[in-house]
């Protein structure tokens, strides 16, 4: 039950972050104009990945879009690759995880395969949630680091009376809404992980037994432990030879051990 | 057709208040905002004030402390009031238009009223 | 403040010639995303003021084609090619890049 309810939980937080990483490359406001030398602008700039927008104090919202692929600075288009790797590996973890989920029946799929699905889509979470994470992360070191350059050269243009003031960008609402995002797929991620571990039985590693038959005693001793990465054949653990007697490894029918996570 | 009509007191006595009313036909305050520019006899234009179609308003700082904007969007009425006045507000106090959905400013005036403070 | 400056108090032309008039801003006008804030207004003797222009070049509705806008962040000209008797009052450049908008003093087109 616990198991679960950590892999549905995982599920939904994951759902929720990925859904919040879309929103956030999608938004305009990556970066919004600094209003500190001027809260009473009458126009408001604000930028995006995909495009930069201008927002006049009548309400009037114009936007443009980048138009050009070469022009734009090498690090936006890492930050929008870093959010499209996120979104990509994220919907592919949805669409896996999905299936994986123990609530949800599909044919004759075993335990085991729906482990292995889980650890698949959970690790695709933490990887999309790092993406993100990252992909904001640039954006505003970028930002931060642009802030402050146009702040030296602020009036560096001054020619007599003339003022040409650059327009300073601090963070927008986009990048928080990333953080949050690839946090939740991340943490997500990490719950699929957590749940794939009590999901499905492993193969059990028989301790060696003696069975005293009449006359002669013979030692039956299975193949070593086999390291399982979930994808081996022997899932059921068949006995070769049961002689009557059990071990304590035996009287559990699905132990919760998983060595690869 | 778009009209902007201005209406109050011709002449006010100095330190009194002014009221102005503007009101509108042609078009709605829910898609327009409307800015009050005044223009001193033989003088340029100042700005005073906006008030915004979602009812936010910006006003010119100078004058900010003798200044109240409010508005009837039913009504289809602008009030502007100006405290404390002094001989040099004397002018003609023009209500203007400005869209909501265009990159147009102040795109039509009223006639103007002309207010004159004098004791 | 944003400080208008319009140099020419007066300009007498003959109808049918072309005619500039100037405006520059203490502080750009051009803003990030390429538009730049300036507008340009017409008073005709004993009317209110009417928008010719906004954002520096794009005539407003009702504007003749006559008239065209150009310049670089702060400094503007508008330019009259063929001058008509209607087209005699004071006109005002704007700034509305920030508050509060401010206007030039004005420049009389006065007919020859």
């Known amino acids: 039950m616990a198991v679960t309810a950590c892999q549905g939980l995982g599920f939904v937080v994951s759902l929720i972050g990925i859904a919040g990483i879309i929103a956030a490359t999608c938004m305009d406001q990556w970066s919004t104009q600094d209003l500190y030398n001027n809260p009473v602008t009458a126009v408001f700039n604000y930028q995006g990945l995909w495009r930069s927008c201008v927002r006049e104090s009548s309400g009037f919202t114009e936007c443009r879009g980048y138009f050009t692929l070469l022009g734009l600075p090498a690090m936006l288009q890492a930050v929008r690759a870093l959010m499209i790797v996120g979104i990509v590996l994220g919907a592919i973890g949805l669409l896996v995880s999905i299936f994986a989920l123990k609530c949800i029946r599909i044919g004759s799929m075993e335990d085991s395969a729906k482990a292995n699905m889980t650890l698949t889509s959970g690790i695709m979470f933490i990887v999309s949630g790092l993406c993100a994470i990252a992909g904001v992360s640039v954006f505003a070191n970028m930002l931060v680091t642009n802030f402050w350059m146009s702040t030296a050269n602020m009036y560096t243009g001054m020619g007599g009376m003339v003022q040409t003031v650059q327009t300073r960008y601090t963070f927008g609402a986009a990048l928080f809404v990333g953080w949050v995002a690839g946090g939740l797929t991340l943490i997500g991620g990490v719950m699929m992980c957590i749940a794939c571990r009590g999901l499905a039985p492993e193969e059990t590693n028989y301790k060696a037994v003696s069975y005293h038959a009449s006359g002669h005693s013979v030692a039956y001793k299975p193949g070593g432990f086999k390291a399982s990465t979930g994808f081996g054949s022997n899932t059921k653990n068949k006995k070769i030879y049961d002689g009557g007697a059990r071990t304590e490894d035996e009287v559990q029918s699905y132990p919760s051990k998983h060595d690869y996570v | 057709q778009v009209q902007l009509k201005e209406s109050g007191p011709d002449l006010v006595a100095p330190s009194q208040s002014l009221s102005i009313t503007c009101t509108v036909s042609?078009?709605?305050?829910?898609?327009?905002?409307v800015h009050w520019v005044r223009q001193p006899p033989g003088k340029g234009l100042e700005w005073l004030v906006v008030?915004?179609?979602?009812?936010?308003?910006n006003y010119n700082s100078a004058l900010k402390s003798r200044l109240s904007i409010t508005k009837d969007n039913s009504k289809r009425q602008v009030f502007l009031k100006m405290n404390s006045l002094q001989i040099d507000d004397t002018a003609i106090y023009y209500c203007?238009?400005?869209?909501?959905?265009?990159?147009?400013?102040?795109?039509?005036w009223g006639q103007g009223i002309s207010v004159t403070v004098s004791s | 403040d944003i400080v208008m400056t319009q140099d020419a108090p007066s300009i007498p032309v003959t109808p049918g010639e072309s005619v500039s008039i100037s405006c520059r801003s203490s502080?750009?006008?051009?803003?990030?995303?390429?538009?730049?804030?300036l507008y340009w207004f017409l008073q005709r003797p004993g009317q209110s003021p009417h928008l010719l222009l906004y954002?520096?070049?794009n005539p407003a509705s009702g504007a003749p084609d006559r008239f065209s806008g150009s310049g670089s962040g702060t400094e503007f000209t508008l330019r009259i090619s063929r001058v008509e008797a209607e087209d005699v009052g004071v006109y005002y450049c704007?700034?509305?890049?920030?508050?509060?908008?401010?206007f030039g003093a004005g420049t009389r087109l006065e007919l020859k």
């Open positions: 704007m700034q509305y890049l920030e508050y509060p908008p401010t």
């Open positions: 502080k750009s006008l051009l803003n990030s995303n390429g538009n730049t804030y």
């Open positions: 008030i915004w179609s979602d009812g936010r308003i």
């Open positions: 203007v238009r400005h869209p909501a959905f265009g990159p147009h400013a102040m795109d039509y």
């Open positions: 954002r520096m070049s």
């Open positions: 042609g078009f709605s305050l829910t898609n327009y905002g």
